[in-house]
């Protein structure tokens, strides 16, 4: 029961996390900037991974996509890549984990297969969360390194004067969404990995068995040990048959009533 709960909770937490990573990636508020207060209107710039926007206090907003892939900073491309990889891994992880859920029966899928799938999805969620956290952190670092002094620098350019306005960009809402979402995906992944341990068979220790016929037509059930599936009464991997099947270490004894089927 605890395993099912852990697995289910891990799935839900990861689902919320991946939804958050997708939301953060699509958001425009990765960096925000309060430009200036004007007697007429206040103007705000905010930028995301895909486009740049200007908003006035009147509510008017205008957004435009970045020009080309080539003209963009390598760091922005890296952040985009990390976020997309995070989303793709997370989506695949969700798909795998749906089939791995203990509460869902698909054909005659064994618990060992479900355990492997749970572990796979857990690892995928962990990597997905790390990708998102890394992407957001790289962008945050870009903002910190661009947190210039607010002094204006004048120089002459083509067609007149160019004034570089070194305004301070601040962390946008998308960064916080990304960090939280990445963390949730990571936690969900860890929970899936923990659940995997509970799903996995406790002992799959099959000993080499030699069979010694001690009667005329005696049938033996093969396999002196049975791996636990987590269901039924044989949860401690006890020996099922005492006689007939003997390991090579054991002394041969006379057949008992348990040897016959």
């Amino acid at each position: 029961m605890a395993v099912t709960a852990c697995q289910g909770l891990g799935f839900v937490v990861s689902l919320i996390g991946i939804a958050g990573i997708i939301a953060a990636t699509c958001m425009d508020q990765w960096s925000t900037q309060d430009l200036y207060n004007n007697p007429v209107t206040a103007v705000f710039n905010y930028q995301g991974l895909w486009r740049s926007c200007v908003r006035e206090s009147s509510g008017f907003t205008e957004c435009r996509g970045y020009f080309t892939l080539l003209g963009l900073p390598a760091m922005l491309q890296a952040v985009r890549a990390l976020m997309i990889v995070g989303i793709v891994l997370g989506a695949i992880g969700l798909l795998v984990s749906i089939f791995a859920l203990k509460c869902i029966r698909i054909g005659s899928m064994e618990d060992s297969a479900k355990a492997n799938m749970t572990l796979t999805s857990g690892i995928m969620f962990i990597v997905s969360g790390l990708c998102a956290i890394a992407g957001v952190s790289v962008f945050a670092n870009m903002l910190v390194t661009n947190f210039w002094m607010s002094t204006a620098n004048m120089y002459t350019g083509m067609g007149g004067m160019v004034q570089t306005v070194q305004t301070r960009y601040t962390f946008g809402a998308a960064l916080f969404v990304g960090w939280v979402a990445g963390g949730l995906t990571l936690i969900g992944g860890v929970m899936m990995c923990i659940a995997c341990r509970g799903l996995a068979p406790e002992e799959t220790n099959y000993k080499a068995v030699s069979y010694h016929a001690s009667g005329h037509s005696v049938a033996y059930k093969p396999g002196g040990f049975k791996a636990s599936t987590g269901f039924g009464s044989n949860t401690k991997n006890k020996k099922i048959y005492d006689g007939g099947a003997r390991t090579e270490d054991e002394v041969q004894s006379y057949p008992s009533k348990h040897d016959y089927v």
Epitope: S31, Q33, L35, N38, V40, T41, V43, N45, Q47, S52, C53, V54, E56, S58, F60, E62, R64, Y66, F67, G71, L72, P73, L76, M142, L143, N146, A152, G157, G159, G160, M161, V162, Q163, T164, V165, T167, Y169
Partner: nanobody
């Protein structure tokens, strides 16, 4: 790089009219605002009028009621219609644009200026 090119300046009689134009070109993501400033010898540049993306305008007291600023967002152009010109309006008129050119890149660009002379 963003270029601002002004045109429309010249010599005009007091009480006359002039229309200044400014065209912006180059890598412009967002035009926060564009405006006209003027400078007379020995004085600092002063704001005449500015216009935001939404069309919201801002005028200096000396320009109110006589000057009208307008904008064509598609062409990235601004215009300054100057009516009832006075000799004290004589100055070099500069076009100004506050522009976002890329990620974390915001610059204020100035044109080379156009001379407006109002004779009495």
């Amino acid at each position: 790089q963003v270029q601002l090119v002004e045109s429309g300046g010249g010599l005009v009689q007091a009480g006359g009219s002039l229309r200044l134009s400014c065209a912006a070109s180059g890598r412009i993501l967002n035009l926060n605002d564009m405006g006209w400033y003027r400078q007379t010898p020995g004085k600092q540049r002063e704001l005449v009028a500015s216009i935001f993306s939404s069309g919201t305008t801002n005028y200096a007291d000396s320009a109110k009621g006589r000057f009208t600023i307008s904008r064509d967002n598609a062409k990235k152009m601004i215009y300054l219609q100057m009516n009832s010109l006075k000799p004290e309006d004589t100055a070099v008129y500069y076009c100004n644009a506050d522009v976002v050119t890329g990620l974390l890149q915001r610059n204020v660009y100035w044109g080379q200026g156009t001379q407006v002379t109002v004779s009495s």
